[in-house]
C-alpha cells in the first residue's frame, strides 16, 4: 500500500516542499500532540460487562517501542448478578495505528512504516446463531 | 529504544534512540488492509452498547479517512431489546499515530501525529453514590 499522492483536486504542490529521494518520504517522528493528556474514563476495563486486561508489548526496533494490547477476560459477558453469561459474547474491538519499524541489513539501517492492529477493549454482543443440520 | 546488537564489524556510529527525522519507504508494511470497520464486523449493531460510525476525512492526513464511533444510547440494550438506563454505553478511546503532511500539501513529507479516536462502545455497570 502506498501513501496516496496529493490530489490536484485539493491543491498544487508548494515550492517549499523538501527534496525527497524517489520511492521514499521524509518523516519527522517528533510527535504532534505528544504531551496531550487525555482524560480516559477510569476503570472501564473492570466495570465493563465484557471486561478486559492490558498487556504491554515492547520492541526496541519499533517506534513507539511500547504498544498496549487488550484481551477480553471472558468468553461470555458479565450479567447483573456478576456471573458470566455464555449466551452472550465478549469480543475484541480493534483499531489500526501506524508505527515506524527499524530494520538492520548488514551495517545499514532502514526505516519502514507499518500498520499495526491494536485491540483497544471489548464489547458484549448477541451472537448470531446457526443451527447446523 | 535500544538497538539489537549487530555485526561487530559495523561502525558504532548509530544513536541508540530513533533519530528525529527518518527517510522511510513509501510502501507501508501492512497486513491489515481493511480500514472500514463497517465491513470488518457488525459488532457496532450487535453490541449491547451499539454505536454509529462517522467518517472523518482529512486530505492532509494519512490515513485520510478515520471512522469515529458514537454510542447510540446513553444506556445499554437489555435482553428484551430495550434500553436499560441503569447501565452505561461508554466509548472506548484509543490514541493512534497518523501522518500529517508537513509542510502542508507536500506529497512526501510528513510528521507523526497522535490523535484520540473513539473506536467502539462498551457497556459499563456504574458504581452508584447517593449525594447527601
Amino acid at each position: 500500500r502506498k501513501i496516496p499522492k496529493v490530489g490536484h483536486t485539493f491543491f498544487q504542490k508548494p515550492e517549499s516542499c523538501p527534496p525527497v529521494p524517489g520511492g521514499s518520504m521524509k518523516l519527522d517522528i517528533g510527535i504532534i500532540n505528544e504531551n496531550q493528556r487525555v482524560s480516559m474514563s477510569r476503570n472501564i476495563e473492570s466495570r465493563s460487562t465484557s471486561p478486559w486486561n492490558y498487556t504491554v508489548t515492547w520492541d526496541p526496533n519499533r517506534y513507539p517501542s511500547e504498544v498496549v494490547q487488550a484481551q477480553c477476560r471472558n468468553l461470555g459477558c458479565i450479567n447483573a448478578q456478576g456471573k458470566e453469561d455464555i449466551s452472550m459474547n465478549s469480543v475484541p474491538i480493534q483499531q489500526e495505528t501506524l508505527v515506524v519499524r527499524r530494520k538492520h541489513q548488514g551495517c545499514s539501517v532502514s526505516f519502514q512504516l507499518e500498520k499495526v492492529l491494536v485491540t483497544v477493549g471489548c464489547t458484549c454482543v448477541t451472537p448470531v446463531i446457526h443451527h447446523v443440520q | 529504544g535500544i538497538t539489537i546488537p549487530r555485526n561487530p564489524g559495523c561502525p558504532n556510529s548509530e544513536d541508540k534512540n530513533f533519530p528525529r527525522t527518518v527517510m522511510v519507504n513509501l510502501n507501508i508494511h501492512n497486513r491489515n488492509t481493511n480500514t472500514n470497520p463497517k465491513r470488518s464486523s457488525d459488532y457496532y449493531n450487535r453490541s449491547t452498547s451499539p454505536w454509529n460510525l462517522h467518517r472523518n476525512e482529512d486530505p492532509e492526513r494519512y490515513p485520510s479517512v478515520i471512522w469515529e464511533a458514537k454510542c447510540r444510547h446513553l444506556g445499554c440494550i437489555n435482553a428484551d431489546g430495550n434500553v436499560d438506563y441503569h447501565m452505561n454505553s461508554v466509548p472506548i478511546q484509543q490514541e493512534i499515530l497518523v501522518l500529517r503532511r508537513e509542510p502542508p500539501h507536500c506529497p512526501n513529507s510528513f510528521r507523526l501525529e497522535k490523535i484520540l479516536v473513539s473506536v467502539g462502545c462498551t457497556c459499563v455497570t456504574p458504581i452508584v453514590h447517593h449525594v447527601a
Epitope: S39, S41, R42, I44 | V90, V124, P126, V128, H129, V131
Partner: nanobody, 116 residues
C-alpha cells in the same frame, strides 16, 4: 466530592409547565451524561431524560417525548428539564443523575405534583 443541587419542583395543574434544574459542583469532571429519573411510591426509578456531555445528544422516555426538553450549560455544569403539558401521571419524585461512566451520582430528589 460531588454535590448535586436540585431545584424547581412544586405543585401544578394538569397542562401547566415546570422547569427543574440541577447543578453539579465538586469533582464533576469527565462527565458522560447528565439527566433525570423519577420514582412514584412502590415503583422502581424510571429514566426520564438524559443529555450526553460530549455532543449534547439527548434521549427521552417514550412517556415524556415531545413534552419534556432537557438542556445543559457546560460552563456552569448545570442541566435543566423543561416540563410542558404536565399530566397527573407525571407526579413523582424527580432525581437528578450525574454519570461519570464508571461512577454515578444521584441527587436527593425534588417532588413534582400534578393535579387534575
Amino acid at each position: 466530592e460531588v454535590q448535586l443541587v436540585e431545584s424547581g419542583g412544586g405543585s401544578v395543574q394538569a397542562g401547566d409547565s415546570l422547569r427543574l434544574s440541577c447543578a453539579a459542583s465538586g469533582r464533576a469532571n469527565s462527565i458522560n451524561w447528565f439527566g433525570w429519573f423519577r420514582q412514584t411510591p412502590g415503583k422502581e426509578r424510571e429514566f426520564v431524560a438524559g443529555i450526553r456531555w460530549s455532543d449534547a445528544y439527548t434521549e427521552y422516555a417514550n412517556s415524556v417525548k415531545g413534552r419534556f426538553t432537557i438542556s445543559r450549560d457546560n460552563a456552569k455544569n448545570t442541566v435543566d428539564l423543561q416540563m410542558d403539558s404536565l399530566k397527573p401521571e407525571d407526579t413523582a419524585v424527580y432525581y437528578c443523575v450525574l454519570d461519570l461512566s464508571t461512577v454515578r451520582y444521584w441527587g436527593q430528589g425534588t417532588q413534582v405534583t400534578v393535579s387534575s
